[in-house]
Amino acid sequence: LQDLCSNCPAGTFCDNNRSQICSPCPPNSFSSAGGQRTCDICRQCKGVFKTRKECSSTSNAECDCISGYHCLGAECSMCEQDCKQGQELTKKGCKDCCFGTFNDQKRGICRPWTNCSLDGKSVLVNGTKERDVVCGPSPADLSPGASSATPPAPAREPGHSPQ
């Protein structure tokens, strides 16, 4: 008997009430694999969810979040409110990133600016609430400084001696 059911393709179910004939999934249901004894109910994308992909007899519907929200969890199981760049979502709503932190997305938390000096770099562009600092070469990466030089040349011009 099991062999009969295993012949039922995706999009059908093995109908015990009808001598294990393969019956098509009813409307608003699907089976994504063969040999199923029942079809699963299609997911409905309602409220803050919107349909990204319609349900078919062989695959479940896929949901997205409506504008102003973003997906969380596997297969977009939840929608969370967007904030602006430079903010993070707290229990009290969207709050600006504290000084020294940034968030360049509409979701997630504010993260600390990179500490360039830890890598022996210098700050090329300061950080903002929306952007991390940009680290660049330190002065010592660009030239060896006065250590590379012969003794500085003596002053040669009245009123214009090197400082």
Partner: antibody
Framework: QVQLKESGPGLVAPSQSLSITCTVS????????ISWIRQPPGKGLEWLGV???????NYNSTFMSRLSINKDNSKSQVFLKMNSLQTDDTAIYYC?????WGQGTSVTVSS | DVVMTQTPLSLPVSLGDQASISCRSS???????????LHWFLQKPGQSPKLLIY???NRFPGVPDRFSGSGSGTDFTLKISRVEAEDLGVYFC?????????FGGGTKLEIK
């Protein structure tokens, strides 16, 4: 953010002197050395000299007798003075932090 | 003075090709502090030079990863893995190890 801007006379008569001021922003002259580099029309780059963070200077020996570089850290300004200009000193003069260059100031030596 | 010899003088390429520019110095560019102050710049027409690579192989922030630098001692190379239109211009190598700082004569990257 880091910026260097040269301001010069544009036209200099032969045998006269050239003075260019470089005003920097976004960093301190006590942290970075500043060089002067020039580029004659259609030619390569020529290093003139450097003023180190501590105020000491080094010059390209080719220009040593007629070049002076100074700075004012508090005003974020570096000064180039070159004497006895000739027509072959016609060039774009750049104020340079190595990783950032000014836009250059064009100097033409002509009577 | 340290002489920097750049080859080739002109480099015709097709877009998408790899390009390679060589720079040789007349003496070692290894400073007593262990660093090698060999930098690469790109100058586009009417613009000031822009730093691409510092200390032989370090890409300056914002420089695409198709640019890479290599070498040691007196022999250095700049490679562009897939040339794009915006890469055209004159490339200079520069040494800041020894005073006076000196530059290569430049390599003009142009469309074949």
């Amino acid at each position: 953010q880091v910026q260097l801007k040269e301001s010069g006379p544009g036209l200099v008569a032969p045998s006269q002197s050239l003075s260019i001021t470089c005003t920097v922003s976004g960093f301190s002259l006590t942290t970075y050395d500043i060089s002067w580099i020039r580029q004659p029309p259609g030619k390569g780059l020529e290093w003139l000299g450097v003023i180190w963070t501590g105020g000491g200077t080094n010059y390209n020996s080719t220009f040593m007798s007629r070049l002076s570089i100074n700075k004012d850290n508090s005003k974020s300004q570096v000064f180039l003075k070159m004497n006895s200009l000739q027509t072959d000193d016609t060039a774009i003069y750049y104020c340079v932090r190595v990783d950032y260059w000014g836009q250059g100031t064009s100097v033409t030596v002509s009577s | 003075d340290v002489v920097m010899t750049q080859t080739p003088l002109s480099l015709p390429v097709s877009l998408g090709d790899q390009a390679s520019i060589s720079c040789r110095s007349s003496q070692s560019l290894v400073h007593s502090n262990g660093n090698t102050y060999l930098h690469w710049f790109l100058q586009k027409p009417g613009q000031s030079p822009k730093l691409l690579i510092y200390k032989v192989s370090n890409r300056f922030p914002g420089v695409p990863d198709r640019f890479s630098g290599s070498g040691s001692g007196t022999d250095f190379t700049l490679k562009i893995s897939r040339v794009e239109a915006e890469d055209l211009g004159v490339y200079f190598c520069s040494q800041n190890t020894h005073v006076p700082w000196t530059f290569g004569g430049g390599t003009k990257l142009e469309i074949k």
